[in-house]
Each structure stands twice: as structure tokens, then as C-alpha cells.
């Protein structure tokens, strides 16, 4: 039997990826992060 027409079973969520670097002091280097949907994950 052929399949009846249906959409794919999942939804693609489009999110903005933002790379940032923050200076935290002259002798402490920097924090480099990756923000996904407003949450820092790295």
C-alpha cells in the first residue's frame, strides 16, 4: 500500500547563533562563548 500524504513529523526551529568575546580583565584573558536562543552553551 502507498503512504497517504502527510508532512514530515518534526518541526524545524530556526534560532540565531551569536558568537561573542568578553574582556574580563587585563591579566585574565577573555571568555569566548556561543549563545543559542539566548542561552550561553559554551
Amino acid at each position: 500500500d502507498a503512504e497517504f500524504r502527510h508532512d514530515s513529523g518534526y518541526e524545524v526551529h530556526h534560532q540565531k547563533l551569536v558568537f561573542f568575546a568578553e574582556d574580563v580583565g587585563s591579566n585574565k584573558g577573555a571568555i569566548i562563548g556561543l549563545m543559542v536562543g539566548g542561552v550561553v552553551i559554551a
Partner: antibody
Framework: QVTLKESGPALVKPTQTLTLTCTLS??????????VGWIRQPPGKALEWLAH???????SYNPSLKSRLTISKDTSKNQVVLTMTNMDPVDTATYYC???????????????WGQGTTVTVSA | DVVMTQSPLSLPVTPGEPASISCRSS???????????LEWYLQKPGQSPQLLIY???NRFSGVPDRFSGSGSGTDFTLKISRVEAEDVGVYYC?????????FGQGTKLEIK
């Protein structure tokens, strides 16, 4: 509100062609994902799916009846038409149209049905 | 064709008591997109069918929470936790995964 209404002859003779119309209101068949199907129910018996048409004119038929069925749409009138050739007394039934919409935000089931139109096939 | 077999075909129930209807498909109705298009419809006397449950276990808008659907693969169940007089009619399971789409033969629920 969403409504579907079937119309067509109450009586047809054997070998004749049946033409049924489903008039839609409260939604548009031109909306992406929208579809309308036909289902019938002989007196005292179970439901049988016949055919379905989508907004983009894609069609699906019950293979056991495909040679006799044609489903089409008139988007300007917001109508779906089903024709069934070579009618026989065993085709006596109540014929329903029902809406089914594709899409991840749609339930993808027959959520609204018409009230049905009864067709008797007799000489 | 996918044959949908319901049991029982007749179901007398006392108001307030639970009820259960079984539906078995002759083959898997899992669609390639990962969804199982198993639906339940109720046809009240003299009325058109109305949607109760879609995709096995999702209640349609306005359907009382005493109705629930479950199952997977080829075995599915509709349960009514406490039957009310307004629940009388014929219940049909339906598969929308494979062409031709097919209904069960119906289960007639009546009040004792």
C-alpha cells in the same frame, strides 16, 4: 465558523454518473495544506473512504473505486466535486465530505464533516 | 488494504462505568514520518461522524477528558473513564497512514 455542505441528486438510475458537490465555508481550499475528502456510508453499514484532494491539486483515490471516481476542485467557488460513473444499487449510501489539513500546526485528521447527502440508486 | 478490526461490536454500559474498545490493524500503520495516523470517530444517532482522537492519543478540541486513546504498532484502544448517556453511538477507528484509508466496522455503545 467552519462548515461543509454536500449537495447532489437524491436518486440516480443504474449506469448513470453521480455528481456531488461539497461547498466549503469558514475556510479556503487555497490555503496551503488544506484538503477535502469524500467518505460514504451504505445504510446500516460502516464508513468507506473514497478520495481526497489537496490545495495544490494533488489527489488520492481508493484503488477499488479509482476507475469510477474523479475528484476536482473549484477554488473560486470554494467547492470540491466528486463524480462517480456507472452507478449501481450497491452504491446507495450517505455521502459525506470532510476536511483534513496538512501542517505541523494542524491536527491532520478529519476535523470537520458535512451533514451528508443520501443517494439512492434505483431504476 | 489495511483491515481495521474492532472489538466488541456491541458494548452495553451502565452510566458512570468505564468502557473500552479495541482496534487492531492488519499491518503497521506507522508512517515514514514517524507519526501513527490512528483516529477515533463517534457517530451519534442520526448525525455525521465527529472526531474524538487523532494520532493515537490526542484529544480533539472540545472532547471531554474522560475519553483517552492509547496504543502502538497494530494494537490500539479507546477508553471512556465514566460513560455518560450522551456517549451513545457508533465508534469507529480509522487509519490515515496507508492508501486506501480504512475504517473499522464500528462498535455500537448503548446504555444499559
Amino acid at each position: 465558523q467552519v462548515t461543509l455542505k454536500e449537495s447532489g441528486p437524491a436518486l440516480v438510475k443504474p449506469t448513470q454518473t453521480l455528481t456531488l458537490t461539497c461547498t466549503l465555508s469558514g475556510f479556503s481550499l487555497s490555503t496551503s495544506g488544506m484538503g477535502v475528502g469524500w467518505i460514504r456510508q451504505p445504510p446500516g453499514k460502516a464508513l468507506e473512504w473514497l478520495a481526497h484532494i489537496w490545495w495544490d491539486d494533488d489527489k488520492s483515490y481508493n484503488p477499488s473505486l479509482k476507475s469510477r471516481l474523479t475528484i476536482s476542485k473549484d477554488t473560486s467557488k470554494n467547492q470540491v466535486v466528486l463524480t462517480m460513473t456507472n452507478m449501481d444499487p450497491v452504491d446507495t449510501a450517505t455521502y459525506y465530505c470532510a476536511r483534513r489539513q496538512l501542517g505541523l500546526r494542524s491536527i491532520d485528521a478529519m476535523d470537520y464533516w458535512g451533514q451528508g447527502t443520501t443517494v439512492t440508486v434505483s431504476a | 488494504d489495511v483491515v481495521m478490526t474492532q472489538s466488541p461490536l456491541s458494548l452495553p454500559v451502565t452510566p458512570g462505568e468505564p468502557a473500552s474498545i479495541s482496534c487492531r490493524s492488519s499491518q503497521s500503520i506507522l508512517h515514514s514520518n514517524g507519526n501513527t495516523y490512528l483516529e477515533w470517530y463517534l457517530q451519534k444517532p442520526g448525525q455525521s461522524p465527529q472526531l474524538l482522537i487523532y494520532k493515537v492519543s490526542n484529544r480533539f478540541s472540545g472532547v471531554p477528558d474522560r475519553f483517552s486513546g492509547s496504543g502502538s504498532g497494530t494494537d490500539f484502544t479507546l477508553k471512556i473513564s465514566r460513560v455518560e448517556a450522551e456517549d451513545v453511538g457508533v465508534y469507529y477507528c480509522f487509519q490515515g497512514s496507508l492508501v486506501p484509508l480504512t475504517f473499522g466496522q464500528g462498535t455500537k455503545l448503548e446504555i444499559k
